[in-house]
Amino acid sequence: VEVQVSEDPVVALVDTDATLRCSFSPEPGFSLAQLNLIWQLTDTKQLVHSFTEGRDQGSAYSNRTALFPDLLVQGNASLRLQRVRVTDEGSYTCFVSIQDFDSAAVSLQVAAPYSKPSMTLEPNKDLRPGNMVTITCSSYQGYPEAEVFWKDGQGVPLTGNVTTSQMANERGLFDVHSVLRVVLGANGTYSCLVRNPVLQQDAHGSVTITGQPLTF
């Protein structure tokens, strides 16, 4: 028996369902009574789901996993993982035994898009050219950790005087706060880009300072 899984990681959005694909090639005359299937977490060896003696043994993992019972006889041993969480991320091994056995591992990469950044300015009034201002770009509820880029109105990267912090909440999602300290010119636009490296999703925010009033 030969087990096959997708080479590329499976990317799943938080709170959606994911399918970890695993297949084997059944011999002619194969019946489910011959199949022994185990899904486990590769690193910890924790049992996730199993099928043996022709019976689905059920989920051993948060009651959020399921097989595709009608497709098993065709060699489809894929696992459905419902309501994906950040903590589900990692490698899963599909073990199949019929007479011989084989196994293969598939990676699950969890992701969540970042919100459109909100921009704040400190101080936010009586601004004059030459003043030092602090611009904060905040984006929420993303995963994994973001990459943050700052640019001026001409698209020139601003790398100095940038401090970025990322804090995970109780669900493991990150809130990102990036602070740019800059000396004001006569007027200018400051843009922040928050990128999710897995989803290749960019969230943009900008602030334009034209004397008074401010434009966000």
Epitope: V1, E2, N36, T52, R55, S97, D100, S103
Partner: antibody
Framework: DVQLVESGGGVVRPGESLRLSCAAS????????MSWVRQAPGEGLEWVSS????????LYADSVKGRFTISRDSSNNSLYLQMNSLRAEDTAVYYC??????????WGLGTLVTVSS | EIVLTQSPGTLTLSPGERATLSCRAS??????LAWYQQRPGQAPRLLIY???SRATGIPDRFSGSGSGTEFTLTISSLQSEDFAVYYC??????????FGGGTKVEIK
Amino acid sequence: DVQLVESGGGVVRPGESLRLSCAASGFTFSSYAMSWVRQAPGEGLEWVSSISGSGGSTLYADSVKGRFTISRDSSNNSLYLQMNSLRAEDTAVYYCAKARNNFFDYWGLGTLVTVSS
Amino acid sequence: EIVLTQSPGTLTLSPGERATLSCRASRSILTSLAWYQQRPGQAPRLLIYGANSRATGIPDRFSGSGSGTEFTLTISSLQSEDFAVYYCQQYYDWLTITFGGGTKVEIK
């Protein structure tokens, strides 16, 4: 007739290495998983390791993980067990067994490994 | 891992008597259980698999029964060659195969 013949046992010191071999005949070697099972003197049976028919998948008991390596060569119908960092508690008769659905339908006569200083 | 407990440790019987050997699993293994016989100085030999299916060439005086956590190997009428050690093995968790500690059947 299925035949399994182990070799390579002997006396070694703790920390040393040994390689066991098992010559198989009488069945389509590449179609079956193979295993090593050991038996310490006067004790019961302990599963050590298994390898799939293709050789692409392996399983190990926690007691030997990281020290023992199972392998096979279908060109000469042979099964191997490379044993490194041997300990006194590895002293046992090592049996080569043909696996079918994860039980063992044929066994060799075994080869004795003694780890002693 | 699944722990298999065999009882009794030793069974002392006469030829022609019935032997009943027990194997208890620490959790349900359905019928994923095999029995082996090991005579002194010999390799183990498969007797029963799937809790109740006799292996090729095994006499019908050997029978297996049970499912879940309780299993029995019965030898209906002991022959001289049946005096040996008997082991059960679970393969429900086939990633970590385990054996029972064995039951020795000796001549009275």
